[in-house]
Structure formats: structure tokens, C-alpha cells
Interface confidence: low
Amino acid sequence: FVRTKIDTTENLLNTEVHSSPAQRWSMQVPPEVSAEAGDAAVLPCTFTHPHRHYDGPLTAIWRAGEPYAGPQVFRCAAARGSELCQTALSLHGRFRLLGNPRRNDLSLRVERLALADDRRYFCRVEFAGDVHDRYESRHGVRLHVTAAPRIVNISVLPSPAHAFRALCTAEGEPPPALAWSGPALGNSLAAVRSPREGHGHLVTAELPALTHDGRYTCTAANSLGRSEASVYLFRFHGASGAST
């Protein structure tokens, strides 16, 4: 990016000098912030810049996924001399600026966290006016969202040779351990696929062959809690159907 060398409050400001915080661009973000699903989290971000006393227009931006190219989740703009940063974008209305960009603070609050929010976030500030300059954190802050287990799907499906199999899918962070219990099973970990490709918080456990009628219960547990769901298998003997 282009850095201006002229600053109206200094005769000449060499922005390449890195000797003091006031004379260089830098951003301070923690590598990671942890919070539970449903709660709120603060993503801290403060910065220093070489343009002393800058009070021109500025834009504060947060993006997700990757720096420079990831989708924006929050954007606000402050007019010249104003300390109010007017929100122009807040994805799903859940992102709110906590900091004051005029005071070098871009800290963001994320409301009603979901597991899908578990990703890396990058703060960015843009100056426009007499000075045209911008800076973005390269590493960003990883938002680690934890969640108690939730069983998202439990089902009985037909399998070859008039048999039936049961599937249980749960989500949580840390990814939950799954166990099946039911007729003649005791407690079985069954065939666990963990986690599903591209779905880091989803875990699926399969019971490949249900040999007895009755109630089959899937239990999902992690360090934050446990969840149970049941499915019933009643076969019409002499027929190939089942009631679940």
C-alpha cells in the first residue's frame, strides 16, 4: 500500500522509521479469544500510526477468514473530526464496535455466538482525506467458540438384506464423544466418524446393524455437558418395513 510522506502537522514525517510507537503502523491483537456459544465475545484490536493528530475521515473494518480478502463482517465510518463511527455493515446485526477508532481502538463485540463464528478475524483501519493510508492486522485474532453438545440428527435408515442402521450426528466444541446404548448393546461407541470433512464441529456415530426392536439412545458428551436423543425401532415381523 502507499504511505504518504507529508503530514500537515509535521514538516516531514518519515513513516519508515520504526523507533517509537507513534512513528509506525502497528496493530495489537491477541492470538486467540475464547467464548461459549450463545455468549458474547470481545475481539480486542488497538493500533498505532505515523499520522499524528489525524482527524480526517476514517473507516474501521473487520473481516473474517483471511486478511485483505476475507468477507467483511463489520464496517463503520467516521466523518472528519467526529468520534462517532457510523455502522455501515454489521453481519446479522451481531457485531458492534466497542472501541473508539479516534483513540486507536477498533475492539469489536460479537453477540450471540454460534459455532460457525469460530474462525480468524482481522481488523483494518483506513484513513481518507489529506492523508490516504490503511493498515490491517496480518495474523488477526482467532475466535474459539466452545459449545456443549447438541444432537442435530438421529435417524434409522434401511440397509441391505432387510436390516436397519442408525445414525446420530452431534455438534459441539470440543467435538463430543458419541455413544449408543440400546437392546443387547450395552454402551457402544459404534462406528464413529469424527469430525465430518468440512464440518469441524460435527461428529457422526453409526450403528451398522440393529438386531433387536426397542429404544436406541445416542449420548453426546464433552467437557461442557451432555445431550441425549432416542429413536425407536419396531419391525413388523414378516414384513420388510419398520416403524421409527
Partner: antibody, heavy 122, light 106 residues
Framework: QVQLQQSGAELVRPGTSVQMSCKAA????????IGWVKQRPGHGLEWVGD????????NNNEKFRGKATLTADTSSSTAYMQLRGLTSDDSAIYYC???????????????WGQGTSVTVSS | QIILSQSPALLSASPGEKVTMTCRAS?????MYWYQQKPGSSPKPWIY???NLTSGVPARFSGSGSGTSYSLTISRVEAEDAATYFC?????????FGGGSRLEIR
């Protein structure tokens, strides 16, 4: 130049509390994190937590939850750590350090205080 | 948490020798950081982001590695290098340090 000046050694009774300080000079206190590190002989270095005075935000090592409380006073550019319910396991040297989290693509504890020695003894 | 294991715990070398100390992580980390500590003094940042020397660190020091295995090497040891060296990771909380490798000069 950047300096972190820590408070003096403490000799305290088991079950009591202690508060130590870390006074920063030579840089803008509200622009950087201050980290706290515990060192016991034979136990190496252990991260306790850190605080950003500019936004009063803390990161804590879960191991020290309920044991250590981090605060900062921006008017005096001083960070504090309070330890409570002291036992002999808390006898150690505690360092404060300035943490530069995102500059030149790296994280680093770039300046350290001289350490505060805490001895817990009856 | 990520556990960092340093070896050897104690190294003894003569001036001019080459020494290498290693730091192994219990799970993969992106970078490793190294600090030098002399008796009675605070730790000093020595190497950041695996291979970058902090200001004032002699060029005879180098850092390398990736994933779970990292090392600090001194090409030609000098008497002033006698110290304990700690590795540290910022990859995931809690940030952790290794137990240290103490270098003594014969």
C-alpha cells in the same frame, strides 16, 4: 527507553494475599499488552495471564483462575497482579513483560521487568 | 495445552564449538520463540518467529524448525553465551514455555 519497574520482594503468610506492581515507562502504556510470567526453580517459566490497559481486557491461564487477578491503572501507567489464597506453591519470582502481539508478523515479550520475589512461609 | 519439551536439559561446550538445542511440541505450532536467561536476571527475547534474531543478538545464533520440532543453534560458542534458553509457543492458550536448556562453557 522502555522500562518496566516491579515492586519489591514479599514475604507473606499462607492463606493471605499479595499485590505486586509493574510501572511502565518509555512507551505508550495503553498501546501494548502486559503479560505476567511465574518462575519457580526447577519449574521453568509459566504464563499467568496478560492485560491490555487500553481496553481493560485480560487473557488468563485457566490454571490461575481464582488465584491471580490482573488490573491496570492508566493514569500511573502501572499494571498490578494480585495473588490470593497463597500456598508454598506460589513461592516464585513473578515477572511482568510488555507483549507486542502483532508487529512484523510475530508475537514477542520484548521488555521484561526485573521480577518480584514472593516467598510464602509461616 | 501444548507441552514443550527441551533437550538436552544441560549442555556443556568449549568455546568455538557448535551446539544445538531442541524443543519438541506435543502438537504442531506455527512458530517457535526463544528467550535467554542468565542467573539473577530476567529472560531476554532472543529469537522470534522461529528464525528471526532480536536486536543485538549475535549472528552466530540461529533458529530453525517447523511443526513439532524446533532448534536453536550456536555456530561457535562464546563464554558470554552461558545461560538457560527457553522455547515458547503462542499458537494456543495457555501460552507455554519449555523447561529450559542450560548451556555451560567449559
Amino acid at each position: 527507553q522502555v522500562q518496566l519497574q516491579q515492586s519489591g520482594a514479599e514475604l507473606v503468610r499462607p492463606g493471605t494475599s499479595v499485590q505486586m506492581s509493574c510501572k511502565a515507562a518509555g512507551y505508550t502504556f495503553t498501546n501494548y499488552w502486559i503479560g505476567w510470567v511465574k518462575q519457580r526453580p526447577g519449574h521453568g517459566l509459566e504464563w499467568v495471564g496478560d492485560i491490555h490497559p487500553g481496553i481493560n481486557y485480560t487473557n488468563n491461564n485457566e490454571k490461575f483462575r481464582g488465584k491471580a487477578t490482573l488490573t491496570a491503572d492508566t493514569s500511573s501507567s502501572t499494571a498490578y497482579m494480585q495473588l490470593r489464597g497463597l500456598t508454598s506453591d506460589d513461592s516464585a519470582i513473578y515477572y511482568c513483560a510488555r507483549v507486542d502481539y502483532d508487529y512484523d508478523g510475530s508475537y514477542i515479550m520484548d521488555y521484561w521487568g526485573q521480577g518480584t520475589s514472593v516467598t510464602v512461609s509461616s | 495445552q501444548i507441552i514443550l519439551s527441551q533437550s538436552p536439559a544441560l549442555l556443556s561446550a568449549s568455546p568455538g564449538e557448535k551446539v544445538t538445542m531442541t524443543c519438541r511440541a506435543s502438537s504442531s505450532v506455527s512458530y517457535m520463540y526463544w528467550y535467554q536467561q542468565k542467573p539473577g536476571s530476567s529472560p531476554k527475547p532472543w529469537i522470534y518467529a522461529t528464525s528471526n534474531l532480536t536486536s543485538g543478538v549475535p549472528a552466530r545464533f540461529s533458529g530453525s524448525g517447523s511443526g513439532t520440532s524446533y532448534s536453536l543453534t550456536i555456530s561457535r560458542v562464546e563464554a558470554e553465551d552461558a545461560a538457560t534458553y527457553f522455547c515458547q509457543q503462542w499458537n494456543s492458550k495457555p501460552w507455554t514455555f519449555g523447561g529450559g536448556s542450560r548451556l555451560e562453557i567449559r
